[in-house]
């Protein structure tokens, strides 16, 4: 694709190439044959993040605490505010417009990956030899107790939800 009539950081208007406004500024008036493009800084709580010819700046995102949101990074004239979720909650989408409580892993499942502000808890079923007997957003699957190392024997087999029960070895009379 050949280049267009106006260079990078310019735009074509009324048969001439005008300079775009830099990030953080909005367009007030197009250039003319005799004048440069006129730009103005965005106001408080506004931003534009690209070279542009916008006549209005965008409003910074509001991190609504009623939706479980808090400010992760305050917006500038060139960047939007970045929201994240309160502790124990995570974003419902990439845009992080609302939050939901982290999911807990049920008994029989352990935490594979602890939730973050932007991702939910990832659970995994406890494999043979491991168990989880609680509903938790933090607990991994625990290995069954090794009766042998305690000089004990398995009296009750473990499951994915219960540990083995160890007992004393039967003494030969």
């Amino acid at each position: 694709e050949p280049p267009t009539a106006c260079r990078e950081k310019q735009y074509l208007i009324n048969s001439q190439c005008c300079s775009l406004c830099q990030p953080g500024q909005k367009l007030v008036s197009d250039c003319t044959e005799f004048t440069e493009t006129e730009c103005l800084p965005c106001g408080e709580s506004e931003f534009l993040d690209t070279w542009n010819r916008e006549t209005h700046c965008h409003q910074h995102k509001y991190c609504d605490p009623n939706l479980g949101l808090r400010v992760q990074q305050k917006g500038t004239s060139e960047t939007d505010t970045i929201c994240t979720c309160e502790e124990g909650w995570h974003c419902t989408s990439e845009a992080c417009e609302s939050c939901v409580l982290h999911r807990s892993c049920s008994p029989g499942f352990g935490v594979k990956q602890i939730a973050t502000g932007v991702s939910d808890t990832i659970c995994e079923p406890c494999p043979v030899g491991f168990f989880s007997n609680v509903s938790s957003a933090f607990e991994k699957c625990h290995p069954w107790t090794s009766c042998e190392t305690k000089d004990l024997v398995v009296q009750q087999a473990g499951t994915n939800k219960t540990d083995v029960v160890c007992g004393p070895q039967d003494r030969l009379r």
Epitope: P2, P3, T4, A5, C6, R7, L12, I13, N14, S15, Q16, C17, D30, T32, E33
Partner: antibody
Framework: QVQMLQSGTELVRPGTSVKVSCKAS????????IEWVKQRPGQGLEWIGV????????NYNEKFKGKAILTADKSSSTAYMHLTSLTSDDSAVYFC?????????WGQGTLVTVST | DIQMTQTTSSLSASLGQRVTISCRAS??????LNWYQQKPNGTVRLLIS???RLHSGVPSRFSGSGSGTDYSLTISNLEQEDIATYFC?????????FGGGTKLEIK
């Protein structure tokens, strides 16, 4: 004073091509865009495309993509429009004009007649 | 594409009369509206750019106004040399488009 001097009348055969020239004077050639316009007999004006003589960047009307090729030669301050695969629909007067807050200065027009 | 409409294709007026030619765009063109005069011999010149800016060398009897989608060219005191066809053109959005023209004749 600013002048846009176009090449003379062309009588050409269908299927051939033609190159119309537009020599600019009286201003800095690379400082302004050059626009091209078509006018069929007794009709209105139709925009073909625009070229930046400074570095050869172009924008075309979709309708003229593949029909018109715009170029410019800085050394001679001349813009060119190459019209290809001519048909009777291409018979028209073609104008070049210097940009800058509208089509500020126009050439006198070049009549292209496509006929057997 | 933006459509430019000059509803009056021809207009007859007397010398000395005030004449207004109108032009409508199919969408807002933010005052990027130019007016051209094409004489019977085919020569074209810019009269007014950006709605109301008089081009150098154009007599002050020509003026332009308008906003949004509706624009007009006014000749305050018609002279013989003003006999021509007048075209409006939008420079807001590619492709640039012209009105169909208004041919001005003397009564």
């Amino acid at each position: 004073q600013v002048q846009m001097l176009q090449s003379g009348t062309e009588l050409v055969r269908p299927g051939t091509s033609v190159k119309v020239s537009c020599k600019a004077s009286g201003y800095g050639f690379t400082n302004y865009l050059i626009e091209w316009v078509k006018q069929r007999p007794g009709q209105g004006l139709e925009w073909i495309g625009v070229i930046n003589p400074g570095y050869g960047g172009v924008n075309y009307n979709e309708k003229f993509k593949g029909k018109a090729i715009l170029t410019a030669d800085k050394s001679s301050s001349t813009a060119y429009m190459h019209l290809t695969s001519l048909t009777s629909d291409d018979s028209a007067v073609y104008f070049c004009a210097r940009g800058g807050s509208g089509f500020a200065f126009w050439g006198q027009g070049t009549l292209v007649t496509v006929s057997t | 594409d933006i459509q430019m409409t000059q509803t009056t294709s021809s207009l007859s007026a007397s010398l000395g009369q005030r004449v207004t030619i109108s032009c409508r765009a199919s969408q807002d063109i933010s005052n990027h509206l130019n007016w051209y005069q094409q004489k019977p011999n085919g020569t074209v010149r810019l009269l007014i750019s950006s709605t109301s800016r008089l081009h150098s060398g154009v007599p002050s009897r020509f003026s332009g106004s308008g906003s949004g989608t509706d624009y007009s060219l006014t000749i305050s005191n018609l002279e013989q040399e003003d006999i021509a066809t007048y075209f409006c053109q939008q420079g807001n959005t590619l492709p640039w488009t012209f009105g169909g023209g208004t041919k001005l004749e003397i009564k």
